[in-house]
């Protein structure tokens, strides 16, 4: 007979998830309403398209990007969707409570949904480091803690450092990466004998992971421009992101070949490195004045990504127990940092040019923002990791890591693997 959830989890998961969903429905009932103002319908549709792009990125892009494991592809895609659906609901409420609750009700607009989808994307980036080692009940905890931590981080940053939605959301890369890595660090690491094959990639799942990468590649300009307030800024952000990801694809494929003794191209390198440029230009995508600069950044980001994919997995596998193909965590941690550093460099160049002490002060503020994002990510990640280690969640046994059969019903399989 195929393996099942342990009986206790079978009781715990539906109860936990459905109770939470009921609580969310009640919160929506008492505290939210739609923005009922008269609006131009054509404008509304255009605005919705950005949200749609973000949802495609999250559900298909990140869902499939994490599906390259030989025996964990179903769970990767479906668990991602589950987390996205839950994360968006909680993020809408949280953001409303933090930013507009004094007025009595949270007004839900298309922008709220856009913002919430981006917050939920943070969880989907982080979870790459732990997928296969946790069950759905644990993932619910991770969603709630991470969305709450990110929402509070954004609110603190906007109030203390006076940043707009775009700037404080662009910390998502660094935040999500360090959050995921710190959660992974807390989870049981060594893979027992006989399970090594499960965290290997297979051809068909790798193809679906490439499909995920393609969807992310296509829609990354929408992600980087989604929260900018003026058409001029959005247009610039779209162009620069497009140039950066275009160059990072070329760099990823050629750099991957260069990094291999026989000149072969690694699927794993390519999956992540094609996105490198988009992450690296994220923070300053609207500030870069010309294509060549965005292209240079895409090139640098692609090289860093390939280099990281070559040398970091060994370290990550030993220290954090992250499998070789789960490279989003360290990839985003490096590239997110690169993006933040690029923005700080732009401010430093301003200081040099203007000799203005106030610009120097802005550099310090930006470093403060970045440090705060990393600290909160690490602290909330460690807290989540400790929570996930509690016996109450009935985590999968190490021997059942990266195994779809633990979670899914496969009628055609009479016996376990």
């Amino acid at each position: 007979m195929s393996s099942k959830y342990p009986r206790s989890v079978r009781r715990c998961l539906p109860l936990w998830a459905l109770t939470l969903e009921a609580a969310l429905i009640l919160l929506f009932y008492f505290f939210t309403h739609y923005d009922a103002s008269l609006e131009d319908q054509k404008g509304l549709v255009a605005s919705y398209q950005v949200g749609q792009d973000l949802t495609v990125m999250a559900a298909i892009g990140l869902g499939f990007l994490t599906s390259s494991f030989r025996r964990h592809s179903w769970s990767s895609v479906a668990f991602n969707l589950f987390m996205l659906a839950l994360g968006v609901q909680w993020a809408i409420l949280l953001d409303g409570f933090l930013s507009q609750f004094p007025s009595g009700k949270v007004v839900i607009t298309l922008f709220s949904i856009r913002l919430a989808t981006m917050s939920a994307l943070s969880v989907l980036i982080s979870v790459d480091a732990v997928l296969g080692k946790v069950n759905l009940a644990q993932l619910v905890v991770m969603v709630l803690v991470e969305v709450t931590a990110l929402g509070n981080l954004r609110m603190v940053i906007s109030n203390i450092f006076n940043t707009d939605y775009h700037m404080n959301m662009m910390h998502i890369y660094v935040f999500a990466a360090y959050f995921g890595l710190s959660v992974a660090w807390c989870l049981p690491k060594p893979l027992p004998e006989g399970t090594e094959d499960k965290d290997q990639t297979a051809t068909i799942p790798s193809l679906s992971a490439m499909l995920g990468a393609l969807f992310l590649w296509m829609f990354w300009p929408s992600f980087n421009s989604a929260l900018l307030r003026s058409p001029i800024e959005r247009k610039n952000a779209v162009f620069n992101t497009y140039y950066a990801v275009a160059v990072s694809v070329v760099t990823a494929i050629s750099g991957s070949s260069l990094a291999h003794p026989q000149g072969k191209i690694s699927k794993t390198y390519v999956h992540s490195a094609v996105l490198a440029g988009g992450v690296a230009v994220g923070t300053s995508c609207h500030l870069i004045p010309s294509p060549w600069l965005a292209m240079v950044l895409g090139l640098v980001a692609g090289l860093i990504s390939v280099g990281g994919a070559k040398y970091l997995p060994g370290c990550c596998n030993r220290v954090l127990g992250i499998p070789h193909s789960s490279i989003m965590g360290y990839n985003f941690s490096l590239l997110g940092l690169l993006g933040e550093i690029i923005y700080i460099v732009l401010l430093v160049l301003d200081t040099v040019g203007a000799g203005n002490g106030m610009i120097g002060f802005q550099v310090l503020l930006s470093i403060g923002e970045l440090s705060l994002a990393i600290v909160i990510a690490l602290m909330s990640g460690l807290l989540t990791g400790l929570l996930l280690n509690l016996k109450i969640w009935k985590a999968p046994h190490e021997a059942k890591y990266f195994d779809d059969q633990v979670f899914w019903k496969f009628p055609h399989l009479a016996v376990g693997f």
Epitope: A46, N162, R229, S230, H286, P289, F361
Partner: antibody
């Protein structure tokens, strides 16, 4: 000629509602964020609300949050302010203003400038019993 | 919520130079606050003079200039003319949740 013309003001009793309109002409309305600003008699300017160019995002001053709603119809080049549960302290001249975003560039970065560069002449709202 | 503070009133002689300042309760004002300056004469709508710290609009007279001084936004009027007598408002752009705050205004008197 770039122009904003407010209308809909008048005398209203406390607790009642009023809807202000602002008709825009002479510029591409759909690419500009729009603000409402008010000025009570003998007082300074007070920012009331802003709506992004595509209507996707709105912000309000704490003093009007939950009572006022800003909206726009880009097909009609018109900005609105729906004012509910009016109070005596809402008595003011209400101006609509266009937010202009311009930029300059150095070799390595763009600098954006936000400013309310076009204002209407204002419409007076008096809340009195 | 942030509070933006200006001098309530200043007096200057014709031909003189005067500097109006604009401070934020949240700390030092930087270019990221996009300081704006407006001039308002009695019975008229406000007229923008400066955007983004120091950028003049096409109609702004050359004697008006914007800058950052000691953690505040500043508007300097050199060679003051009698027609410069008005109330001057500064505006700062914040992040979220309240993105725009006006100062209380400075009444400039030209004697």
């Amino acid at each position: 000629e770039v122009q904003l013309v407010e209308s809909g003001g008048g005398v209203v009793q406390p607790g009642r509602s009023l809807r202000l309109s602002c008709a825009a002409s002479g510029f591409t309305f759909r690419t500009s964020a729009m603000h409402w600003v008010r000025q009570a008699p003998g007082k300074g300017l007070e920012w009331v609300a802003v709506i992004w160019y595509d209507g996707s995002n709105k912000y309000y001053a704490d003093s009007v949050k939950g009572r006022f709603t800003i909206s726009r119809d880009n097909s009609k080049n018109t900005l609105y302010l729906q004012m509910n549960s009016l109070r005596a302290e809402d008595t003011a001249v209400y101006y609509c203003a266009r937010e202009m975003v311009s930029y300059s560039s150095s070799w390595y970065r763009r600098y954006y400038y936000y400013n309310m560069d076009v204002w209407g002449k204002g419409t007076t709202v008096t809340v009195s019993s | 919520q942030a509070v933006v503070t200006q001098e309530p009133s200043l007096t200057v002689s014709p031909g003189g130079t005067v500097t109006l300042t604009c401070a934020s309760s949240t700390g030092s004002v930087t270019s990221g606050y996009y300081p704006n300056w407006f001039q308002q004469k009695p019975g008229q709508a406000p007229r923008p003079l400066i955007s983004g710290t120091s950028n003049k609009l096409s109609w702004t007279p050359a004697r008006f200039s914007g800058s950052l001084l000691g953690g505040k936004a500043a508007l300097t009027v050199s060679g003051v003319q009698p027609e410069d007598e008005a109330v001057y408002y500064c505006l700062l752009y914040y992040g979220v949740p309240q993105p725009v705050v006006f100062g209380g205004g400075t009444k400039l008197t030209v004697l």
